[in-house]
Every structure is written in C-alpha cells, then in structure tokens.
C-alpha cells in the first residue's frame, strides 16, 4: 500500500502524478479519494 | 500470463442495446481495475470506462455517460459493458484492459467489434 | 482542457534511430503520460509511463531499445536500431481525477514506417 504521507513527501513528482498514483491505488483498495 | 478474452460484438441497429463480455484468467481478478478502450475503423483509442476491482466505483468519459454501464461478477472472473441507445459512432472493436499499480492499460484482450448500422 | 498532439506519420531506416514525440497541453506540461504500441491488425500493448522528469518503467516484454525522455510539455519515445516489427502505430495517453472524476485521452497516434 502507498500511504498518503509517502506520497506527499516523495520529492520531484508533479501533483498529477502523485493524483495517478493515488487513483490507481484507489482502483485496486477501493479507497475513497475525496 | 495475463489473459484477456472479449465476446459479444455483432451488428445491431441505431437505438438498440448490446452487452460485451470479457473473460479474465491468469491472475487474480478481484484485486485489480479493469477498463474499456475502443478504437473505430481506422481511427485512433478512446477510453470507454473504468471499475475499481470490487465494482464500487466506475468511471466514464461524457460521450457514453448514461448510456454505457461497466460492470464486474468476481465470481466469474468476467468484466461487461452493457451498451444502451447505440449510435453509428459507437462502432469500433471494443478492447478490455487490466491495471497494475503502476499503469492503467497494462494488458489488452484481442477485442470484439460492434458495428450499428440499419 | 487536456489534449495530447502527435504527428501523424514517421518515417526511419532499417537500424536508425527513432524519436517519436507527444506534446501536452502547456497548463499541463508537468503530467505523466503512458506510450502505447499497436502493430497491424493487433490489439495495442503497453509501452511505458513517462514522468515530467524523464524518468520511465516499461511494460513487460518491451525490448531495451526502447526509451523515453521528457523536455517542457514534449514527451518522447526513442526506438533505437530499429526493426521491422517497429512498424506499427504509436498512442500516448494520459490520465488525471478532478473532484473524484476520471478523464483518459489518447494523442491521435503516429504511424511508424520502418524503411528498408
């Protein structure tokens, strides 16, 4: 699992990406991504 | 490997509905999205729709919004797109596509071709 | 709007080098976008992701001669010593969630031709 705090500190990412990542996690966990 | 079957594709006239089917082997289905992509005769992709791996969530782009539904039975390991109110320009051979945590479109089936026409 | 542009159609020798090329548009020229194969007659296959950085990771099964750097709104893909199963045409995509909405668009692909 990718957590949120990983992701928001993981440096040289556009926002895009860090939403892609998220979202893809999202498919697969079926986490709400309010 | 990954395997990615797709059926139901046919000729059917302007206004009528159709269901495709796509058969999943090859890995565990219920942990991954899977999606729709078509492609019309000599044209280029568009995506169709999205479903999260248990089906609580879709996703569709506004050009089927309302007349497609993406849906998914785990227990059979096959994912639908059932289509309503079809179009001329719906016609396109319709790909399922699988995930993978990294990529969205990271395995494609052979695809089926749906044609309305009158 | 989010809008992918490619050139219709390329032209390279038989072992030359190509360097096809994705264009964002400018208010999104930080975005990670995805590659896509599809040789003739076949379904499309997953080439890679490309980040703004120009870092990537490629899809199984995709030779090393395949590569992708990124400059600006500009994503490329780089074939080197090219073959004639290169010949195919070339998709970029990319993705994005607005207010828990997904959008997906292609570019409007490129036509490799491997002469020779």
């Known amino acids: 699992a990718v957590s949120e705090h990983q992701l928001l500190h993981d440096k040289g990412k556009s926002i895009q990406d860090l939403r892609r990542r998220f979202f893809l996690h999202h498919l697969i966990a079926e986490i709400h991504t309010a | 490997q990954v395997q990615l079957v797709e059926s139901g594709g046919g000729v059917v006239q302007p206004g009528r509905s159709l269901r495709l089917s796509c058969a999943a082997s090859g890995f565990t289905f219920s942990s991954y999205g899977m999606s729709w992509v078509r492609q019309a005769p000599g044209k280029g992709l568009e995506w169709v729709a999205t479903i999260s791996s248990g089906g609580s969530y879709t996703y569709y782009p506004d050009s089927v919004k309302g007349r497609f539904t993406i849906s998914r039975d785990n227990s059979k390991n096959t994912l639908y797109l059932q289509m309503n109110s079809l179009r001329a320009e719906d016609t396109a051979v319709y790909y399922c596509?699988?995930?993978?945590?990294?990529?969205?479109?990271?395995?494609w089936g052979q695809g089926t071709l749906v044609t309305v026409s009158s | 709007q989010l809008v992918l542009t490619q050139s219709s159609s390329a032209s390279f020798s038989l072992g030359a080098s190509a360097k096809l090329t994705c264009t964002l548009s400018s208010q999104h020229s930080t975005y990670t976008i995805e590659w896509y194969q599809q040789q003739p007659l076949k379904p499309p296959k997953y080439v890679m992701d490309l980040k703004q950085d120009g870092s990537h990771s490629t899809g199984d099964g995709i030779p090393d001669r395949f590569s992708g750097s990124s400059s600006g709104a500009e994503r490329y893909l780089t074939i080197s010593s090219l073959q004639s199963e290169d010949e195919a045409d070339y998709y970029c995509g990319v993705g994005d969630t607005i207010k828990e909405q997904f959008v997906y668009v292609f570019g409007g692909g490129t036509k490799l031709t491997v002469l020779g």
């Open positions: 596509a699988r995930q993978t945590t990294m990529t969205y479109f990271a395995y």
